[in-house]
């Protein structure tokens, strides 16, 4: 087959304006705004939070994922694109799935808040694909994974009675097992032909570096938005600040000790930051005292750096997942270390009280993550056989990674 | 003292509107969600609705959704709720009462319960032609 | 839709004794229940929270026990202030909802 880049130009314009032609309709039809006057204070107190994630979505993971060398523009621009697209459609599903029986969707700013960590569950499935795929395949993706984590948020719910801060904090392990299942199912990189385009480069790699930056600075906002009262966002807040505070430390430190001449990996530090806010995202308002934060945060950081250096290789034969992506792999095992730490210290306290349930409460919490990577696998491979059929124009394995297969360059420098 | 105060009531024909205020005193109210419980004469409490302590959140009973809205002015201490289309079967004294998030303290985790701590005295409504 | 059951409708105990009510869901609401006294013409007053923590105020006569779907409300040595109506109340994560059982009203024997 032809090694010239296939024109997505019938196929993306059409796709995405009729996606959100339908996506007007459903919000003329089916939705309103709240209509009560609240507190000024109060609405911009509760706007920064969804500000905040919004910065994180677009600015923090969008850069965090431009680190390589001929692939950085697509990285950013199609990031917002699917954040864009999964905020309107998360909007519409989860108002669907909680709300529709009374007739219309009410659109709050909590309605947003949500929405928009929906959307970002994509943005870090996505870290496995970019740059194998176009943005009409995206666009699926989007619409897939948005609607299998809407749905998985529910039943889990429905089932195991947890709320919104509990079951939306699968999102680290559902992301990242669905964006690999996905990368499983596309075609390898040509070995020959991608060499010189998934290696990082320096001002590409300071923007990932300053993707991280944004990521770590907001992830306590993350890590309590959905929370229901002060006290729990307080706790949040303040624990994620230590476990992302130390694994920074452990990361840099980590970095250094793994290499032979004691140099620091920017690959590491762009993901290991970050480890602690992920580790402790679901028992972040449960957890009682900074030290316990900032061990977490220790392990997350040895964790992820140890990741980083064993398991790209591994990866990258098995997934066709460049050396540089390393999100999926680390928010896996993140992901399930934050897990791990739930039950933990569910059973270390059940126990210490005594009560007979601990048993009970053990296996609901194994049956929660055990239904997320299943959805997650599951959904993701549905995903990865879709973008697979020929209707999408998928650009050739030759032409992985590479800006130039849906930009305008006005001048093509040589090292672009 | 912590205190919560429901005014508004009175008789109103059906298909009309009424709005019901709460004013909180004694406690940081910015602090805390808010509900709205109602018990019809010679019948049991239903509850009506719940705001989130910053305004971000509502949830409603099936029986009102649609037709009333709760909220908030933290600036003013008042929680508010706007009751449209009302119904005979809307009848009730109608209670506002501040949701209790309480943190219990375990050896290696934190333990939030929720409750209805403090209610105020009611407000009659009668929805009558 | 979470249906709370009390029961018994109507419990008659005489004072001093020990009375036992219950409360029963339709499915598992965890631990997120709580107990609250009503006297006629007052406001609801809230016992336990958590299943079986006494809010603050309350004696040490009242206890709260259970957890999933079956829960119980024991008064260990009834006085005289004791008698009037008790709900038990759910607290769904997922949509937000609150049901209030029926309510069982405690009458002097």
């Known amino acids: 087959s032809s090694k010239y880049p296939r024109s997505v130009r019938r196929c993306l314009p059409l796709w995405a304006l009729t996606l959100e032609a339908a996506l007007i309709l459903l919000f003329y039809f089916f939705t309103h705004y709240d209509a009560s006057l609240e507190d000024q204070k109060g609405l911009v107190a509760s706007y920064q939070v969804g500000q905040d994630l919004t910065v994180m979505a677009a600015i923090g993971l969008g850069f965090l994922t431009s680190s390589f060398r001929r692939h950085s523009w697509s990285s950013v621009a199609f990031n917002l694109f699917m954040l864009a697209l999964g905020v309107q459609w998360a909007i519409l599903l989860d108002g669907f799935l909680s709300q529709f029986p009374s007739g219309k969707v009410v659109i709050t700013l909590f309605s947003i808040r949500l929405a928009t960590m929906s959307a970002l569950s994509v943005l870090i499935s996505v870290d496995a694909v970019l740059g194998k795929v176009n943005l009409a395949q995206l666009v699926v993706m989007v619409l897939v994974e948005v609607t299998a984590l809407g749905n998985l948020r529910m039943v889990i719910s429905n089932i195991f009675n947890t709320d919104y801060h509990m079951n939306m904090m699968h999102i680290y392990v559902f992301a990242a097992y669905f964006g690999l299942s996905v990368a499983w199912c596309l075609p390898k990189p040509l070995p020959e032909g991608t060499e010189d385009k998934d290696q990082t480069a320096t001002i590409p790699s300071l923007s990932a570096m300053l993707g991280a930056l944004f990521l770590w600075m907001f992830w306590p906002s993350f890590n309590s938005a959905l929370l229901r009262s002060p006290i729990e966002r307080k706790n949040a807040v303040f624990n994620t600040y230590y476990a992302v505070a130390v694994s920074v430390v452990t990361a840099i430190s980590g970095s250094s000790l793994a290499h032979p001449q004691g140099k620091i990996s920017k690959t590491y530090v762009h993901s290991a930051v970050l480890a602690g806010g992920v580790a402790v995202g679901t028992s972040c308002h449960l957890i009682p005292s900074p030290w316990l934060a900032m061990v977490l945060g220790l392990v997350a950081g040895l964790i992820s750096v140890g990741g980083a250096k064993y398991l790209p290789g591994c990866c990258n034969r098995v997934l066709g997942i460049p050396h540089s992506s390393i999100m999926g792999y680390n928010f896996s095992l993140l992901g399930l270390l934050g897990e791990i730490i739930y039950i933990v210290l569910l059973v270390l306290d059940t126990v210490g009280a005594g009560n007979g349930m601990i048993g009970f409460q053990v296996l609901l919490s194994i049956g929660e993550l055990s239904l997320a990577i299943v959805i997650a696998l599951m959904s993701g491979l549905l995903t990865g056989l879709l973008l697979n059929l020929k209707i999408w124009k998928a650009p050739h394995e030759a032409k992985y990674f590479d800006d130039q297969v849906f930009w305008k360059f006005p001048h093509l420098a040589v090292g672009f | 003292q912590v205190q919560l105060v429901e005014s508004g009531g009175g008789v109103v024909q059906p298909g009309r509107s009424l709005r019901l205020s709460c004013a909180a005193s004694?406690?940081?109210?910015?602090?805390?969600?808010m509900h709205w419980v109602r018990q019809a004469p010679g019948k049991g409490l239903e509850w009506v609705a719940v705001i989130w302590y910053d305004g971000s959140n509502k949830y409603y009973a099936d029986s009102v959704k649609g037709r009333f809205t709760i909220s908030r002015d933290n600036s003013k201490n008042t929680l508010y709720l706007q009751m449209n289309s009302l119904r005979a079967e809307d009848t009730a004294v109608y209670y506002c009462?501040?949701?209790?998030?309480?943190?219990?303290?375990?050896?290696?985790?934190?333990?939030?319960?929720?409750?209805?701590?403090?209610w105020g005295k009611g407000t009659t409504v009668t929805v009558s032609s | 839709e979470i249906v709370m059951t009390q029961s018994p409708a109507t419990l008659s105990v005489s004072p001093g004794e020990r009375a036992t009510l219950s409360c029963r869901a339709s499915?598992?609401?965890?631990?997120?229940l709580a107990w609250y006294q009503q006297k006629p013409g007052q406001a609801p007053r809230l016992l336990i929270y958590g299943a079986s923590t006494r809010a603050t105020g309350i004696p040490a006569r009242f206890s709260g026990s259970g957890s999933g779907t079956e829960f119980t409300l024991t008064i260990s040595s009834l006085q005289s202030e004791d008698f009037a109506v008790y709900y038990c109340q759910q607290y769904n994560n997922w949509p937000t909802l609150y049901t209030f059982g029926q309510g069982t009203k405690l009458e002097i024997k």
């Open positions: 004694g406690f940081t109210f910015s602090s805390y969600g």
């Open positions: 009462a501040r949701d209790m998030v309480t943190m219990v303290r375990g050896a290696y985790r934190n333990y939030y319960y929720y409750g209805m701590d403090v």
């Open positions: 499915q598992s609401v965890s631990s997120n």
